[in-house]
Amino acid sequence: RPSFSLVEDTTLEPEEPPTKYQISQPEVYVAAPGESLEVRCLLKDAAVISWTKDGVHLGPNNRTVLIGEYLQIKGATPRDSGLYACTASRTVDSETWYFMVNVTDAISSGDDEDDTDGAEDFVSENSNNKRAPYWTNTEKMEKRLHAVPAANTVKFRCPAGGNPMPTMRWLKNGKEFKQEHRIGGYKVRNQHWSLIMESVVPSDKGNYTCVVENEYGSINHTYHLDVVERSPHRPILQAGLPANASTVVGGDVEFVCKVYSDAQPHIQWIKHVEKNGSKYGPDGLPYLKVLKHSGINSSNAEVLALFNVTEADAGEYICKVSNYIGQANQSAWLTVLPKQQAPGREKEITASPDYLE
């Protein structure tokens, strides 16, 4: 990550509020804890595929299997959540595809929040057929481990039948679960055999047991709730972007920087420049000029378009993104060819001091 001195006449303070541009959103794959997940890298003509998670190289291990264009995660856990990328390296270029993995169960027990289908779980028996409690929909009870982001709503269900109609009560960690045990209490919908906790917090973690009983017997089922805590994080930039580019003198070129951020990102496009004939300041750091930044008068800040380029435009272009929490930056090189040479997409160019304009 480069260090630099900003050229004095390009300081951006105070910043203007960013425009409401759309921050790129990758495709999201959702898995429940314990499930296996398989994702195919959606890139064509891939000679070699490499994988990253949250910008860090991903290799095979006892739960992660990489076969050709497929990534398999066995027995997913919330720690597998994150921003994944597969990069296809070809003979002339490379391309990256991004996707999110979210291992969670926001509305639990295999049901939607509205309980629209719950009525059929309330089974009425012929009054002559006495029967101990039994589960009527075990599919909705298969997931025992529920990892839920803080502040989400959790629902546990134990659809049951019996004659006479059983009653249902809930235990937390083996003890009677009382309303005063959590701020905001909880809801029990007996007709839907459900327990609902809104806006969960870390203290809600634990084992929740439904006990369903009538005079002929008792059955129970236990769910484990884990509350995944959230905090704001620094921006993440899509690997491989901006990409190196080349064009002829007088041509046009575009650099793209894709940003994933959960706090307002400020995007800057920066280039090495000279000041008083020098590329470096007294501190030895290069002078850099802000070409574009997110703000009121700036259109899509994720794209830097250069028109009618000259040889002086050649060099390194840095996409620098910051939010209140931290920064990220990546760079690409622009090669400007004489008019007679045809432009083409370049391979990655290794930066060297001699390459500066």
């Epitope: 990550r1 480069p2 260090s3 630099f4 303070e13 105070p14 910043e15 203007e16 509020p17 960013p18 409401k20 905090s231 704001p232 620094r234 959960d262 706090a263 307002q264 910051s322 939010n323 209140y324 929490i325 931290g326 920064q327």
Partner: antibody, heavy 113, light 108 residues
């Protein structure tokens, strides 16, 4: 665990210099801004500025530009706030914060003749 | 600079009350809005809500945030004894990252 530990309280005379510190631990110090916030006695919070330790990128509130200097030494995971010439009006509690979520305990600076 | 104006500057409430504090920005600070902090005497501020409505880890669910554009609200659904403190909003969209002047919540 993740924490920021600030240097102890200081009592100084007007015109003296001072450098207070904020040491981070339990996380990657270079990956988060360190913000400095002033709170004068009985008053509210004022954002002074911030530094990104990885590359020493620094930004100041116009109200504090030229009045203080923010720096960092990433090799020892420490950020600094310094004054070259203190004034009585600098008397305040100074907090450092990692982003928004982790705050130091504060350093009380008293400037009095 | 973007000014953040909080109201009221102080309020008296009882345990169990629903408390609402508002913060108005001098200009639109969408799309990623404001933070809310709680501060008790002699203590550092504590982050409650980030980006207007996201509950910070470990913060009780009785705290919630809402709003967009220029108007933001912190709500405490049922005031608890430990909630008597001063609350600050902050915008983190544009330098300088300004705070509101604070709202002191006192016992009635």
């Amino acid at each position: 665990q993740v924490q920021l530990v600030q240097s102890g309280a200081e009592v100084k005379k007007p015109g003296e210099s001072l450098k207070i510190s904020c040491k981070g631990s339990g996380y990657s110090f270079t990956n988060y801004y360190i913000h400095w916030v002033r709170q004068m006695p009985g008053k509210g919070l004022e954002w002074m500025g911030a530094i990104y330790p990885d590359n020493s990128d620094t930004t100041y509130s116009p109200s504090f530009q030229g009045q203080v200097t923010i720096s960092a030494d990433k090799s020892i995971s420490t950020a600094y706030l310094q004054w070259s010439s203190l004034k009585a009006s600098d008397t305040a509690m100074y907090y450092c914060a990692r982003g928004a979520d982790i705050w130091g305990q504060g350093t009380l600076v008293t400037v009095s003749s | 600079d973007i000014q953040m104006t909080q109201s009221p500057s102080s309020l008296s409430a009882s345990v169990g009350d629903r408390v609402t504090i508002t913060c108005r920005a001098s200009q639109d600070i969408d799309p990623y809005l404001s933070n809310w902090y709680q501060q008790k005497p002699g203590k550092a501020p504590k982050l409650l809500i980030y980006d207007a409505s996201n509950l910070q880890s470990g913060v009780p669910s009785r705290f919630s945030g809402s709003g967009s554009g220029t108007d933001f609200t912190l709500t405490i659904s049922s005031l608890q004894p430990e909630d008597f403190a001063t609350y600050y909003c902050q915008q983190t969209t544009s330098h300088p990252y300004t705070f509101g002047q604070g709202t002191k919540v006192e016992i009635k």
